[in-house]
């Protein structure tokens, strides 16, 4: 089931999926002056069996016959209402994502790929937030959002991250920033999805690792 909306926007923060749930689609977008090959796929799809997940279809771009300067926009499958754009940088993997069943890792870039990636997320997808450069977390509660199905509608949980450009004024010096901690929250507050040990390790790493883990910047 596709998520109706994009993950929540948080002021001065970006989000990143550490892995993509099966069913996630990534549009095949090409940079200016290039287009999808005629027989090429509209999108890549994360699919898999019980032991292995991977991206079906390959995106391929070819030089446009008419090199106009307008941005190429890939047609959307009809049922998709929303799209999320991500700016491509180096495809470094922060954590071994292959260890998470039912999820695909970040697809490698393809030749002449557009600078933005447009994903269509599915129910159960989790994304992680951090403050952009020049800002810090004034408060970091659970800094993730999960796409959930409630009463037949999809919604994303609200991440509890507040970023500020001000200098630190902590009342308790030396106290570490908290980890995102799904366990221990009442049901109404819980991101009640994906709770494998591997993913919790990723969650903890996402909360503590340096900016470099967010190699794909979300617009």
């Amino acid at each position: 089931e596709l998520c109706d909306d994009d993950p929540p926007e948080i002021p001065h923060a970006t989000f990143k999926a550490m892995a993509y749930k099966e069913g996630t689609m990534l549009n095949c977008e090409c940079k200016r002056g290039f287009r999808r090959i005629k027989s090429g796929s509209l999108y890549m799809l994360c699919t898999g069996n019980s032991s292995h997940s991977s991206w079906d279809n390959q995106c391929q771009c070819t030089s446009s016959a008419t090199r106009n300067t307008t941005k190429q926009v890939t047609p959307q499958p009809e049922e998709q209402k929303e799209r999320k754009t991500t700016e491509m940088q180096s495809p470094m993997q922060p954590v071994d994502q292959a260890s998470l069943p039912g999820h695909c890792r970040e697809p490698p870039p393809w030749e002449n790929e557009a600078t933005e990636r447009i994903y269509h997320f599915v129910v159960g997808q989790m994304v992680y937030y951090q403050c952009v450069q020049g800002y810090r977390a004034l408060h970091r509660g659970p800094a993730e959002s999960v796409c959930k199905m409630t009463h037949g509608k999809t919604r994303w949980t609200q991440p509890q991250l507040i970023c500020t450009g001000e200098m630190e004024t902590s009342q308790f010096p030396g106290e570490e920033k908290p980890q995102a901690s799904p366990e221990g929250r009442p049901e109404s507050e819980t991101s009640c999805l994906v709770t494998t040990t591997d993913f919790q390790i990723q969650t903890e790493m996402a909360a503590t690792m340096e900016t470099s883990i967010f190699t794909t910047e979300y617009q």
């Epitope: 926007e9 970091r140 509660g141 509890q160 507040i162 507050e189």
Partner: antibody, heavy 115, light 107 residues
């Protein structure tokens, strides 16, 4: 269910200080930051500031720097706001609210400053 | 500081009708605006955040739209329980700022 329970009404003399409280329950207290908001006839709602319930980090509206001091006690899941050197202009209802989008609010604490 | 101008300051409407409130900001706030309903003797209630995202449990009669510096909030098919004061809040950067409020009354 999520609740923010605030302390009762206060009637105080000008020049003194007062400390009001906001106790969170029904959720993991340290997951959510807490905000304080002033409601007065003159200025409707005014955002006073925010405190991290996790580490006590704060950010104030410049208008309330030196007037309000926010603190938090994790052990009792309670946030406090002290208002100093009170004048009649501080008479108002003060609310606490939680989180990155103020999704739950306390019932308000009425402060009356009168000689 | 970013200024928030909410209008109108008061509004009289008929039950079953539609009302629209607006908030204008002095700078682009990138859709980081929320709307709250406030009734006497209670704490305010979050209705919409990030311009148009309805808070769970809020009826779909409520809606929000806008971008840049101009935002609006609408209530369709006005019901008696909608009578309240409504506030916008910009939260794109600290310190956050509320609009002046709109008192909604029934004609």
């Amino acid at each position: 269910q999520v609740q923010l329970q605030q302390s009762g009404p206060e009637v105080v003399r000008p020049g003194v200080s007062v400390k009001i409280s906001c106790k969170g329950s029904g959720y993991t207290f340290t997951d959510y930051a807490l905000h304080w908001v002033k409601q007065s006839h003159a200025k409707s709602l005014e955002w006073i500031g925010i405190i991290s319930s996790y580490n006590g980090d704060t950010s104030y509206n410049p208008r309330f720097k030196g007037k309000a001091t926010m603190t938090v006690d994790k052990s009792s899941s309670t946030a406090y706001m002290e208002l100093a050197r009170l004048t009649s202009e501080d008479s108002a209802i003060y609310y606490c609210a939680r989180g990155s989008n103020l999704d739950y609010w306390g019932q308000g604490t009425t402060l009356t400053v009168s000689s | 500081d970013i200024q928030m101008t909410q209008s109108p300051s008061s509004l009289s409407a008929s039950l079953g009708g539609k009302v629209t409130l607006t908030c204008k900001t002095s700078q682009d706030i990138n859709k980081f605006i929320a709307w709250y309903q406030h009734k006497p003797g209670e704490g305010p209630r979050l209705i919409i955040h990030y311009t148009s995202t309805l808070q769970p449990g809020i009826p779909s009669r409520f809606s929000g739209s806008g971008s840049g510096k101009d935002y609006s909030f609408s209530i369709n098919n006005l019901e008696p329980e909608d009578i309240a004061t409504y506030y916008c809040l910009r939260y794109d950067d600290l310190p956050w700022t509320f609009g002046g409020g709109t008192k909604l009354e029934v004609r």
